[in-house]
């Protein structure tokens, strides 16, 4: 969390910030709030990013003005404009690309005062795992599939009878280039399981981190599967 | 509410160039939360994207058409306009012009359309 | 560019039965996904956005659904006045692009 204060000593205003990451080519939010004025067309919101000469976003008297907008951002930015009122000047963001990665500042104008807070943005492909038994192998096998993946993670696998074993002697994993020449699918094998356990296969990079259990009985098999972003932290 | 009309000669010569110009009525063309575009749909068949521009100017095309395009804005006018050089017989259509939303950016509303043939 | 591909290119459906449009992005496009309905000789009419979201106006016998590269246009009843040619495009990157359209025609 990041809380920035306005300069000007009784004439600022708190902003808050989250560190946030975005899913490439997925569409993301850069999360700000602020200390709510009570008029609409006094509150200026502008988002800028670290490195870039143009505005990233910009919000005053109750619309979008875009005048100023780089190019880069053109037609990919909104702000929720009916919730500007109540302090929310977080920012939609269309098609998030790995170039938008980086720091940005929430920089707020209200009758009250100004204030601003960075945030850092991280940027990459994550997805859920999804683990099956291959049928078509000749032993016991686990499959672990997960389509999009940025930077390249590491795949760990885990099992609940075998708590604390290394699997790495009994499991392949393999990165397959995407058609957009970018993310990854990530394709992990895990040979010699038994039933009546439980497996983990854990998927990581420093952005997202992913598991997807399977539970293999005589009668049945159950999946379930997780993912949690790293580093949100809050300014 | 919110209109808009497109303008302009309805034939156009092969290699000359297609002017048109779309009158904005009912708002202002400087509300800061829409692009202003052009589409266009030849005879029978399917919309194609042209170009956009904002009322500062700024302005983003098809690359498929950027060579011959040139979309401009009068917001003393209350217009923007469109100019395609270098015609052939495909650039024959009917020629649209909608407001743009910055994002999402559905068009909405379109001008009735204006058919432009290119023939000599 | 981002293709987009509309199935059927017809279909006959009789009054008062339910239509359903399908559209394809050859990549994914999240949300980014809008709906028009074009009737001969007039302009496009934006019905839906967001996938999902109906425009102002817009009966709610019309709903959008999908995300990604698969998207859906459901009429639930057809009225005399839908039938026409209905278009997808979509706005996740440019160029901004279109489907090549499906007409709904009376059976």
């Known amino acids: 969390l990041i809380i920035g204060f306005g300069i000007s000593g009784r004439h600022s205003i708190t902003v808050t910030t989250v560190a946030s990451a975005g899913n490439i080519g997925e569409d993301g939010i850069l999360s700000c709030t602020f200390e709510p004025d009570i008029k609409l067309s006094d509150i200026v919101i502008q988002w800028l990013k670290e490195g870039v000469l143009g505005l990233v976003h910009e919000f005053k008297e109750g619309k979008d003005e875009l005048s100023e907008q780089d190019e880069m951002f053109r037609g990919r930015t909104a702000v929720f404009a009916d919730q500007v009122i109540v302090g929310n000047a977080s920012l939609r963001l269309k098609n998030v690309q790995l170039t938008d990665a980086g720091t940005y500042k929430c920089y707020i104008i209200t009758s009250k005062g100004k204030g601003n807070a960075n945030l850092e943005y991280k940027t990459g492909a994550f997805s859920m795992p999804e683990v099956n038994v291959d049928y078509n192998a000749s032993s016991e096998t686990l499959r672990c599939e997960a389509p999009r993946w940025f930077p390249q993670p590491t795949v760990v696998w885990a099992s609940q009878v075998d708590q604390g074993a290394n699997f790495s002697e009994v499991s392949n994993t393999s990165f397959e280039l995407n058609s957009e020449n970018v993310t990854m699918k990530v394709v992990s094998v895990l040979y010699n399981v038994t039933i009546n356990n439980t497996y983990s296969c854990m998927i990581e990079n420093d952005i997202a981190k992913a598991t997807g259990d399977i539970k293999v009985t005589e009668s049945e098999i159950k999946r379930r599967s997780h993912l949690q972003l790293l580093n949100s932290k809050a300014s | 509410q919110l209109q808009l009309q497109e303008s302009g000669p309805g034939l156009v010569k092969p290699s000359e160039t297609l002017s048109l110009t779309c009158t904005v009525s009912?708002?202002?063309?400087?509300?800061?939360?829409?692009?202003w575009g052009w589409i266009r749909q030849p005879p029978g068949k399917g919309l194609e994207w042209i170009g956009n521009i904002y009322y500062s100017g700024s302005t983003y095309y098809n690359p498929s058409l950027r060579s011959r395009v040139t979309i401009s804005v009068d917001t003393s006018k209350n217009q923007f306009s469109l100019k395609l050089s270098s015609v052939t017989a495909a650039d024959t259509a009917v020629y649209y012009c909608?407001?743009?939303?910055?994002?999402?950016?559905?068009?909405?509303?379109w001008g009735q359309g204006t058919l432009v043939t290119v023939s000599s | 560019e981002i293709v987009m591909t509309q199935s059927p290119a017809t279909l006959s459906v009789s009054p008062g039965e339910r239509a359903t449009l399908s559209c394809r992005a050859s990549?994914?496009?999240?949300?980014?996904l809008a709906w028009y309905q074009q009737k001969p000789g007039q302009a496009p009419r934006l019905l839906i956005y967001?996938?999902?979201t109906r425009a102002t106006g817009i009966p709610a016998r019309f709903s959008g659904s999908g995300s990604g590269t698969e998207f859906t246009l459901t009429i639930s009843s057809l009225q005399s006045e839908d039938f026409a040619v209905y278009y997808c495009?979509?706005?996740?990157?440019?160029?901004?692009?279109f489907g090549g359209g499906t007409k709904v025609e009376i059976k």
């Open positions: 495009q979509q706005y996740h990157s440019f160029p901004f692009t």
């Open positions: 967001g996938a999902s």
């Open positions: 909608a407001r743009e939303g910055s994002y999402p950016n559905q068009f909405d509303p």
């Open positions: 009912g708002g202002s063309i400087k509300s800061g939360s829409y692009y």
């Open positions: 990549q994914s496009v999240s949300s980014n």
